[in-house]
């Protein structure tokens, strides 16, 4: 039975040209995290494997940095980066947990972070 929940940074706004940290946290489970995948819609951005460490997809190597922790840092943001980002926790024995963050990249300087919220 899957008892865990994923807390994410929720809705995030950031300025064009800036950087942002995407973070998820898995709680309320004793399951072992074997791998975390970060995806943008249907594109794989990065993998953090418990044994093998980080792998960044070649097409994102220039703008994506691993960490902090199991999070992901996106740099040199463009308006085209607006959209959904998913953290997919592969765990044993629970299975897969998915968290979601919506990133809004703004032209202006009014960007500010959204509140943290629970993924149902």
């Amino acid at each position: 039975m899957m008892t865990g929940t994923i807390e994410t940074t929720g809705n995030i706004s950031a300025e064009k040209g800036g950087s942002i940290i995407l973070q998820c946290h898995l709680s309320s489970t004793t399951a072992q995290v074997t791998q975390v995948n970060w995806e943008q819609q249907d594109q794989l951005l990065a993998i953090c494997n418990a044994d093998l460490g980080w792998h960044i997809s070649p097409s994102f190597k220039d703008r994506v940095a691993p960490g902090p922790g199991l999070g992901l840092t996106l740099q040199s943001l463009t308006v085209n980066d607006t959209g959904e980002y998913f953290c997919i926790y592969h765990t044993y024995p629970d299975g897969t947990y998915t968290g979601r963050i919506f990133l809004e990249v703004l032209e202006s300087s009014v960007a500010e972070h959204g509140a943290r919220f629970q993924i149902p």
């Epitope: 929720g10 959904e84 919506f102 809004e104 959204g114």
Partner: nanobody, 125 residues
Framework: QVQLVESGGGLVQAGGSLRLSCAAS????????MGWFRQAPGKEREVVAA????????YYKDSVKGRFTMSRDNAKSTVYLQMNSLKPDDTARYYC??????????????????WGQGTQVTVSS
Amino acid sequence: QVQLVESGGGLVQAGGSLRLSCAASERTFSSFAMGWFRQAPGKEREVVAAIDPSGRYIYYKDSVKGRFTMSRDNAKSTVYLQMNSLKPDDTARYYCAARIRGEGYYTRSSFYHYWGQGTQVTVSS
């Protein structure tokens, strides 16, 4: 309980157009993120288009970009999918989905709370 009712499907020749509508029963529709999905026989359900509550951000599946347009009318609690230059590959049952208190758009079916019964779109060659 939110009721979603799709309409506008039918049989059309390749290159033709259809406009799908999805009417919601809920008055708080303006806070819903909405999506259009489709499922062809023997295939998995896939997202076609998705829209945030304000209508500012819209996602399109790559294969429909430039051909399909999703829009919403919050005053009428309705979303639309204008489908132009239809292809036989577009043949499927099209479903409308709603997520209450949406943040941005949602492209994965597991994040939606309510679904319509679907409307069939058949494109003949």
